[in-house]
């Protein structure tokens, strides 16, 4: 459940051993962009192990990745956003792997957040309102959103609603009442970008309030 | 297998500070977004701080400048600096790693005078 997923075209003859994913966060720090990179196995020895990008960077040829414990990671303005990168795992002046990336195609959105659910009693339902930090940037503006709500005693039945924007109302009579409900949402670049789903956003419970009886029963879901 | 397990927790006067703690195992640390949520006798659990993979942080407004989160990679774990306590900062605290069908035990925080 790390968010990534493969891409690209893996390359050389010891792929079993060093199979690797990434992924892109683009303007993650004002204007720096981000890529994370780590090993499918989490049991490689990454002792000697080093990353390296080349191709379709600004002004340099090639960029080195920093070591943070079992991931690799590069933050820097030099990404120029067309064509294909290759990224290789070397160990000294020796590639071990490489994949061909085209960094607009691993985006990984940041989460969204600031996830809150208020009641209309007037209109009996309920308004999920939420923030993505997308809205103010430059590239990944165009987002798809999966909000996923279910009832907190029903461990894996999560009901999922696909929305563009960051508002969405959920029917009172759709769901149970006098029951918590835990509620949470990610995004998936939907335009020019591709990519992966971002991680869920925290978690917001609300409780449903009980049934009106001069209102009638509340359709069950 | 996951496990997350948090520590720390006390009965401290309004105005005081605690640090709390939580030690992860079975996820890949590094690469996850890590949460801290509390849950007051009888409310609603709710979310009180975020730190990211990336290290950017998150609070929900009523601990803002009295909570500061933070992690360390090499240990996995996230702490949770708590200053500035308030009575209303009572509740069991539990780290988080984005799945919530995983929960620790919780830590209990009871600020009273």
């Known amino acids: 459940e790390s968010g990534y997923a493969q891409n690209g075209d893996l390359e050389d003859a010891e792929l079993d051993d060093y199979s690797f994913s990434c992924y892109s966060q683009l303007e993650v720090n004002g204007s720096q962009h981000s890529l994370t990179c780590a090993f499918e196995d989490p049991d490689v020895n990454i002792t000697n192990l080093e990353f390296e990008i080349c191709g379709a960077l600004v002004e340099v040829k090639c960029l080195n990745f920093r070591k943070l414990q079992e991931i690799y990671f590069i933050e820097t303005k030099k990404f120029l956003l067309i064509g294909k990168s290759n990224i290789c795992v070397k160990v000294g002046e020796k590639s071990l792997t490489c994949k061909k990336i085209d960094l607009t195609t691993i985006v990984k959105p940041e989460a969204p957040f600031d996830l809150s659910v208020v009641y209309r009693e007037g209109a009996n339902d309920f308004v999920v309102t939420f923030n993505t930090s997308h809205l103010q940037k430059k590239y990944v503006k165009v987002l798809m959103h999966d909000v996923a709500y279910r009832q907190e005693k029903d461990e894996n039945k999560w009901t999922h609603v696909n929305l563009s924007s960051t508002k969405l109302t959920l029917l009172q009579r759709k769901l149970q009442p006098a029951a918590m409900y835990e509620i949470k949402v990610r995004s998936i670049p939907d335009h020019y970008f591709k990519g992966f789903w971002s991680e869920w956003s925290p978690s917001y419970y609300f409780r449903t309030p009980e049934i009106n009886n001069s209102s009638g029963e509340m359709d069950p879901i | 297998q996951v496990q997350l397990v948090e520590s720390g927790g006390g009965l401290v006067r309004p105005g005081g500070s605690l640090r709390l703690a939580c030690a992860a195992s079975?996820?890949?640390?590094?690469?996850?977004?890590m949460h801290w949520y509390r849950q007051a006798s009888g409310r609603q659990r709710e979310w009180v701080a975020t730190?990211?993979?990336?290290?950017?942080?998150g609070y929900r407004d009523s601990v803002k400048g009295r909570f500061t989160i933070s992690r360390d990679n090499a240990k996995n774990t996230v702490d949770l600096q708590m200053n500035g306590l308030q009575l209303e900062d009572t509740a069991v605290y539990y780290c988080?790693?984005?799945?919530?069908?995983?929960w620790g035990q919780g830590t209990q925080v009871t600020v009273s005078s």
């Open positions: 079975g996820i890949r640390f590094s690469l996850r977004n």
């Open positions: 988080n790693h984005g799945d919530t069908a995983y």
């Open positions: 730190i990211t993979a990336g290290g950017v942080t």
